[in-house]
């Protein structure tokens, strides 16, 4: 078998054997290696020598392999836009963040760049579940057969409505979609100005 | 101004290292430029050695690659040549030599005024 | 690795006169990978001419270098007393780099 090429080596078709790893470098028509993540390109290649590669300084990242001549500068998590962080920077990777609890991405630009108050699902609703917190505005669902929500909240769940009979009590009235059952006790009446309490 | 200046014993016994530095000054030694040696037979052409750059990677010319060591000492600014099992054709004036440091192109815009090594027992 | 051929071995020329030296590649190195430098008796060699014919930092504009492929020509328009000295091109198309033998400018 031929032996592999080590970089710079000529290439007359633009491509190169490893395209994570290599580059094309047009002007001298040599495939190059590119910087690991972490690292920037200290000195650029020619057709007699490779690639050099630096360390990230401090606060400076870049995530993939490639042929930068500078790191990208780490960027806190900014708080007046919504955001908190979840891991901090490294020399291989951006600070990660994320919305803060309430609040939904509102603007996405590759990333989450602005986070806004999620919207209160009114009484008898609640917010449909997401795969992933913080993705997009809450939409609000009603609460299935059985169960109720009785606020106007971003994060209030619709909760099953009491069954009187596990407590030893009966129904005075039916729950709703935006209240729980009333129960009373079965040797008493229930009085028209306590209708949606339970007695005891 | 940038300067260069080489250093070392001016006569080696055959089979022995040749040692020499090279001293750089009114310039990083760390920056993006390779740093080179090149040599000189008496009345004869040039023949570059090798490079160095300050990271430590090394490129030699695959005629010597087998006796030559090159380092770097980013502290004193300098860098270094040694080349092993030296007979009496390695004589010449030793130069090193900055590589210009533009995209792609391996020529040397500074030189040190060069040092005459002997070998001769 | 790449031979570099340099003709004429000596050139005697006087003053005020134009200086044509030629360096020929053993292949092809493209347009870009030439230089040429000067050495005086005692002296290290000074880079005169990169890429082929760029002109380094600090060189009179009577120098000039042109050329491609394998045939390179650098040229003095109008010798100066401080022009003769030695020249020799130099080669970064390929592992190892290479210097042509040289050619001394002599006055005649």
């Known amino acids: 078998s031929q032996p592999q090429a080590v970089p710079p080596y000529a290439s007359e078709n633009q491509t190169c054997r490893d395209q994570e790893k290599e580059y094309y470098e047009p002007q001298h028509r040599i495939c190059c290696s590119r910087c690991p993540p972490g690292t920037y390109v200290s000195a650029k290649c020619s057709r007699i020598r490779d690639t050099v590669c630096a360390t990230c300084a401090e606060n400076s990242y870049n995530e993939h392999w490639n042929y930068l001549t500078i790191c990208q500068l780490c960027r806190p998590c900014d708080p007046v836009m919504g955001l908190e962080e979840i891991a901090p920077c490294t020399s291989k990777r951006k600070t990660q963040c994320r919305c803060q609890p309430g609040m939904f991405c509102a603007a996405w630009a590759l990333e989450c760049t602005h986070c806004e108050l999620l919207s209160d699902c009114p009484p008898g609703t609640e917010a449909e579940l997401k795969d992933e917190v913080g993705k997009g505005n809450n939409h609000c669902v009603p609460c299935k057969a059985g169960h109720f929500q009785n606020t106007s909240s971003p994060s209030a769940r619709c909760q099953p409505h009491t069954r009187c009979e596990n407590q030893g009590l009966v129904e005075a009235a039916p729950g709703t979609a935006q209240s729980d059952t009333t129960c009373k006790n079965p040797l008493e009446p229930l009085p028209p100005e306590m209708s949606g309490t339970m007695l005891m | 101004q940038v300067q260069l200046q080489e250093s070392g014993p001016g006569l080696v016994k055959p089979s022995d290292t040749l040692s020499l530095t090279c001293a750089v000054s009114g310039y990083s030694i760390s920056s993006r430029n390779w740093w080179g040696w090149i040599r000189q037979p008496p009345g004869k052409g040039l023949e570059w050695i090798g490079y160095i750059h300050y990271i430590g990677n090394t490129y030699y010319n695959p005629s010597l690659k087998s006796r030559v060591t090159m380092s770097v000492d980013t502290s004193k600014n300098q860098f270094s040549l040694k080349l092993s099992s030296v007979t009496a054709v390695d004589t010449a004036v030793y130069y090193c030599?900055?590589?210009?440091?533009?995209?792609?192109?391996?020529?040397?815009?500074?030189w040190g005024q060069g040092t005459m090594v002997t070998v001769s027992s | 690795e790449i031979v570099l051929t340099q003709s004429p071995v000596t050139l005697s020329l006087s003053p005020g006169e134009r200086a044509t030296l030629s360096c020929r590649a053993s292949?092809?190195?493209?347009?870009?990978?030439l230089a040429w430098y000067q050495q005086k008796p005692g002296q290290a060699p000074r880079l005169l001419i990169y890429g082929a014919s760029g002109r380094a930092t600090g060189i009179p504009d009577r120098f000039s270098g042109s050329g491609s492929g394998t045939d390179f020509t650098l040229t003095i328009s109008r010798l100066e007393p401080e022009d003769f000295a030695l020249y020799y091109c130099?080669?970064?198309?390929?592992?190892?780099?290479?210097f042509g033998h040289g050619t001394r400018l002599d006055i005649k």
């Open positions: 292949q092809s190195i493209g347009s870009s990978y």
């Open positions: 030599a900055r590589e210009t440091g533009s995209d792609g192109d391996d020529t040397f815009d500074i």
């Open positions: 130099q080669q970064c198309y390929s592992s190892p780099i290479t």
